[in-house]
Amino acid sequence: APTSSSTKKTQLQLEHLLLDLQMILNGINNYKNPKLTRMLTFKFYMPKKATELKHLQCLEEELKPLEEVLNLAQSKNFHLRPRDLISNINVIVLELKGSETTFMCEYADETATIVEFLNRWITFCQSIISTLT
């Protein structure tokens, strides 16, 4: 059974994951650049189901494409580069989903824009956090 300290750690990791996903989404939504239109043409795979930490496998598999799309903003001066954000997200995802069980991600038939994709995973984090508090 999970201890209160392990639950606290999971909650903190989910909060950090949530904050960085929101940071990326805000950056895209605020983007005062024609490249935003191009960013929205890229399609992302969405999970068929995302209700448990093991489903973060579906997010992990889309992190490389996410970084590539964010790199379109290369003309900007970054405080944090896309690779810094994606690297941190990857570390958190690996810790949260664990490596002891191999989970095959199932994707929905419909693909999504980067905004829809980020919103889906933001909702996932918020939902899991609410079950822990």
């Epitope: 904050l19 960085d20 996903l21 940071m23 605020n30 896309p82 810094d84 941190n88």
Partner: nanobody, 119 residues
């Protein structure tokens, strides 16, 4: 409006250490980037290190392995632990608060704190 108050600068010998702190107050959003930039005389302002509220970090190549950035989200405070300081680290260090991961006209800057590395 966001106010930034820096502290911890000073004179230190080469090889020494300093810890800079910067507390943000005012209209703070939970999603933000805080960090440190520096400007040496006659040079352009450059990134030293930055950290998001989610813990993502970015370091200038010149400080990797010597400087560590950290933050306390509850206190809206960012810290820069500077070890193995070199004369070329001498500069005015500016605290920065941003609501996005890229530079924007809405970024806020502190007044700066002088760091001098000299024997």
């Amino acid at each position: 409006e966001v106010q930034l108050v820096e502290s911890g600068g000073g004179l230190v010998q080469p090889g020494g250490s300093l810890r800079l702190s910067c507390a943000a107050s005012g209209s703070i959003f939970s999603i933000n980037v805080m960090g440190w930039y520096r400007q040496a005389p006659g040079k352009q302002r450059e990134l030293v290190a930055a950290i998001s509220s989610g813990g993502s970090t970015n370091y200038a190549d010149s400080v990797k392995g010597r400087f560590t950035i950290s933050r306390d989200n509850a206190k809206n405070t960012v810290y820069l632990q500077m070890n193995s300081l070199k004369p070329e680290d001498t500069a005015v260090y500016y605290c920065m608060y941003a609501s996005s991961f890229y530079e924007d006209e809405t970024d806020y800057w502190g007044q700066g704190t002088q760091v001098t590395v000299s024997s």
